[in-house]
């Protein structure tokens, strides 16, 4: 998809001129507010095991293995985001691939990703109303990482 | 600043009707709010060593530590992306935090991120020409992960 930028349109509702043609158009407005995923992701995942595989994708070969959980919102760009869910509280031993090593913690790496939400434009009504896209930061867990526990000074 | 996505406009150059107003557009005023890497950048960016710290950000406490390398493109949204660069070929021992363990590999986790590139609109010329934003997938390394080496069947 290609987007076109219009100058002088940093505040709604000015970003939704009504003199355009009638097909639905999507508009972007910007705000820096951040959004959290629907619910916190726990360590204990359903039926996936806490083990580091010797083949398969990187998330299953990691000694801090994780699964991906889909977060879909039809009014967001991107519609599909994936949250990493750690399968173990501690890191798996490199030797065995199964026993956990209490010296290491398996923790999620979080990132505030830029997303856009589709919202009805202010003052727009009717069948062919246009939409504004609102820029937000959305917290996603990208992966799980094996770290040495933090030592407080 | 607001952008418009036009339905049925997945291919350039159809996204740039020329009947808009003429004022110069200040591209990307709105993206100057730069996105930080998932973890704050450490001050000692120059001399990163292959060791797992007991404090500091997650990327330095990881047993597959990494640094972030800035990738800036003023014609892209977001302008700033950060690539994880692994500091060790193998994972660092959980015991010592410094010696490497040949049983584990420290490897980058790649992700195809959606970005937008500014392109001159087809048929647009002159001082006040408009721009189109073109949606692309861009490969970024998010983090480094400690994995068990792949065993070939």
């Amino acid at each position: 998809v290609s987007l076109r930028i219009q100058e002088g349109c940093s505040h709604l509702p000015s970003c939704c001129p009504s003199k355009e043609q009638e097909p639905p158009e999507e508009w972007l407005k910007w705000s820096s507010a951040s959004v959290s995923p629907p619910e916190p992701l726990s360590h204990t995942h359903h039926a996936e095991s806490c083990r580091a595989s010797k083949d398969g994708p990187l998330n299953s070969r990691a000694i801090s293995p994780w699964s991906y959980e889909l977060d879909r919102d039809l009014n967001r760009v991107p519609q599909d985001l994936y949250h990493a869910r750690c399968l173990c509280p501690h890191c798996v031993s490199l030797q065995t691939g199964s026993h956990m090593d209490p010296l290491g913690n398996s923790v999620p790496l979080y990132h505030n990703q830029t997303v856009f939400y589709r919202r009805p434009c202010h003052g727009e009504e009717g069948t062919h109303r246009r939409y504004c896209l609102e820029r937000r930061l959305y917290r996603v867990s990208l992966a799980c990482v094996c770290v040495r526990p933090r030592v407080m000074a | 600043v607001s952008l418009r996505i036009q339905e049925g406009c997945s291919h350039l150059p159809s996204c740039c009707p020329s009947k808009e107003q003429e004022p110069p557009e200040e591209w990307l005023k709105w993206s100057s709010a730069s996105v930080s890497p998932p973890e704050p950048l450490s001050h000692t960016h120059h001399a990163e060593s292959c060791r797992a710290s007991k404090d500091g950000p997650l990327n330095s406490r990881a047993i597959s530590p990494w640094s972030y390398e800035l990738d800036r493109d003023l014609n892209r949204v977001p302008q700033d992306l950060y690539h994880a660069r692994c500091l060790c070929p193998h994972c660092v021992s959980l015991q010592t935090g410094s010696h490497m363990d040949p049983l584990g590999n420290s490897v980058p986790l790649y992700h195809n991120q959606t970005v937008f590139y500014r392109r001159p609109c087809h048929g647009e010329e002159g001082t006040h020409r408009r721009y189109c934003l073109e949606r692309r997938l861009y490969r970024v390394s998010l983090a480094c992960v400690c994995v068990r080496p792949r065993v070939m069947a």
């Epitope: 998809v1 999507e26 991906y68 959980e69 039809l74 009014n75 760009v77 991107p78 589709r118 | 339905e7």
Partner: antibody
């Protein structure tokens, strides 16, 4: 031509587990999410969950977490669903269904556009 | 979860009739609604997505309409091969949910 070929009927003892397969052909397997649906007593359809074959990402209906494990084998373009700790309540026909996406990017619409023929699972001692 | 209700569980009609099957959602689903046909042999096919868009290969006698919480599927000129059970399904929010089905029979 898009086709989803499911494995044959299963008779399983209570407490046991079963793995159903769904072999895809006629399209790029990693480009489409795969859904799994349960039909009990030849009537109601109930969504179990979905898996993205590209990254293994899943979403489950809450009550099937711990009951259904979804996996894929990209090399053979096959999706699997393993059902655990089976009881008579799990006796049903299970369908795999490809999820197509429609409409202009980036706002897609989603529908289960191609379905497998169904796999009957009977739990009985 | 969003509840989908098909109040009519079975329906009898004559060949050539115009038949309407209704479906309601427990909340506004913004037209994010699909219709499926299940034949007596268990085969399931997508008929309509996004309330009113016909899937490829579906005869034009099928049409869909609705908005908000209320939706319907219409068969304008009933044919023998339309004997089946019809299900609505919302994709507004995960988990996806289906209506209970409406079984269409010939009088």
């Amino acid at each position: 031509e898009v086709q989803l070929q499911q494995s044959g009927p299963e008779l399983v003892k209570p407490g046991g587990s079963v793995r159903i397969s769904c072999k895809a052909s006629g399209y790029s397997f990693t480009g489409y999410t795969m859904n799994w649906v349960k039909q009990s007593h030849g009537k109601n359809l109930e969504w179990i969950g979905l898996i993205n074959p590209d990254n293994g990402g899943t979403s489950h209906k809450q009550r099937f977490m711990g009951k259904a494990t979804l996996t894929v084998d990209k090399s053979s373009s096959t999706a699997y669903m393993e059902l655990l700790s089976l009881t008579s309540e799990d006796s049903a026909v299970y369908y795999c269904a490809r999820e197509g996406y429609y409409g202009p990017s980036p706002f897609h619409h989603y529908a289960m556009d191609y379905w497998g023929q169904g796999t009957s699972v009977t739990v009985s001692s | 979860d969003i509840q989908m209700t098909q109040t009519t569980s079975s329906l009898s009609a004559s060949l050539g009739d115009r038949v309407t099957i209704s479906c309601s959602a427990s909340q506004d689903i913004s037209n994010y609604l699909n219709w499926y046909q299940q034949k007596p042999d268990g085969t399931i096919k997508l008929l309509i997505y996004y309330t009113s868009t016909l899937h490829s290969g579906v005869p034009s006698r099928f049409s869909g309409s609705g908005s908000g919480t209320d939706y319907s599927l219409t068969i304008s000129n009933l044919e023998p091969e339309d004997i089946a059970t019809y299900y609505c399904q919302q994709y507004s929010k995960l988990p996806y949910t289906f209506g209970g089905g409406t079984k269409l029979e010939i009088k």
